[in-house]
Amino acid sequence: YDFTNCDFEKIKAAYLSTISKDLITYMSGTKSTEFNNTVSCSNRPHCLTEIQSLTFNPTAGCASLAKEMFAMKTKAALAIWCPGYSETQINATQAMKKARKSKVTTNKCLEQVSQLQGLWRRFNRPLLKQQGSSDYKDDDDKHHHHHH
């Protein structure tokens, strides 16, 4: 899915209002220094691509994030604010239903969610490229100029 046409500000608002709190709950009891952030993103569509991948794609040692509250709210936000996103996710949803039902918080999952927090932080506050004296542009965000 191409996240270029999402309403980034609405997704950011959803994250700050609810998703971030669910991530904190998931990570409660974990020290911020425990994991090194190795996943990064360069612009807002890229950040959403990485966020989707880490949130919904099962990985070795962490197969259960898609059923977490933050994941469900992330999916809802993307479905609402990214045109056509829902249609692309039908197959993924079916695969999710076949996945294990039990929620197991492994150390690998905690590390993955720590990476997610870094990706969301980057998504929310991309540094703006400057053009001229007062015209700011972010290559990834042509339709949403006030993206802070």
């Epitope: 950011k12 608002a13 220094t33 952030n37 932080r121």
Partner: antibody, heavy 120, light 111 residues
């Protein structure tokens, strides 16, 4: 506990350059925007610019765009702010500040400040 | 750029009194229902300290006597009952539109 420790006070001649360092300890370094803010004696706070350590991307206040250079050294978890062509009006306390955990755009951790005096 | 105007420039009050500080933006700092306005306290010789983020949320470790309100262009920082340690300079800051800007500050002094 995240801490930002800045380099010591500097006295510089007009026309020269100064490079201030800001070393981060604790927490994650690479995924937090790092900002630089200055405060002239008896004056308010003025934003200079910001850098994202993950890839070195920068954003500058237009006022400082031609004279300020922000860099980072991820291996030592240190951010740098270099200001060139110094003039007396650049006499100020320079602060580094880390942006918050969520990307809300506030500064929750500040360095102790570095006093830069520009005098002939 | 967004200009933040704080008033009054100086506020003289006594401990125990209520303090109301204002910050007005030259254009809205709201985005998708959120107000990206933050408040800091600064004492002489110290770095600023975050008090309120996103208009009304209390920063970590900040006493409940501090509160923030407002949206759009008009914001208020209130200290319900002044303690001796509250006398300092207060700054508002917006992050909705680059460049990031601060207000010129309000000095809260003992009457």
């Amino acid at each position: 506990e995240v801490q930002l420790v800045q380099s010591g006070a500097e006295v510089k001649k007009p026309g020269s350059s100064v490079k201030v360092s800001c070393k981060a300890s604790g927490g994650t370094f690479s995924t937090y925007n790092m900002h630089w803010v200055r405060q002239a004696p008896g004056q308010g706070l003025e934003w200079i610019g910001a850098i994202y350590p993950g890839n070195g991307e920068t954003s500058y206040n237009q006022k400082f765009k031609d004279r300020a250079t922000l860099t980072v050294d991820k291996s030592t978890r240190t951010a740098y702010m270099e200001l060139s062509s110094l003039r007396s009006e650049d006499t100020a306390v320079y602060y580094c500040a880390r942006e918050d955990d969520y990307g809300e755009g506030y500064f929750d951790v500040w360095g102790q400040g570095t006093t830069v005096t520009v005098s002939s | 750029e967004i200009v933040l105007t704080q008033s009054p420039a100086t506020l003289s009050l006594s401990p125990g009194e209520r303090a109301t500080l204002s910050c007005r933006a030259s254009e809205s700092v709201d985005n998708s229902g959120l107000s990206f306005m933050h408040w800091y306290q600064q004492k002489p010789g110290q770095a600023p300290r975050l008090l309120i983020y996103r208009a009304s949320n209390l920063g970590s470790g900040i006493p409940a006597r501090f509160s923030g309100s407002g949206s759009g262009t008009d914001f208020t920082l209130t200290i319900s009952s002044l303690e001796p340690e509250d006398f300092a300079v207060y700054y508002c800051q917006q992050i909705n539109t680059d460049p990031l800007t601060f207000g010129q500050g309000t000095k809260l002094e003992i009457k």
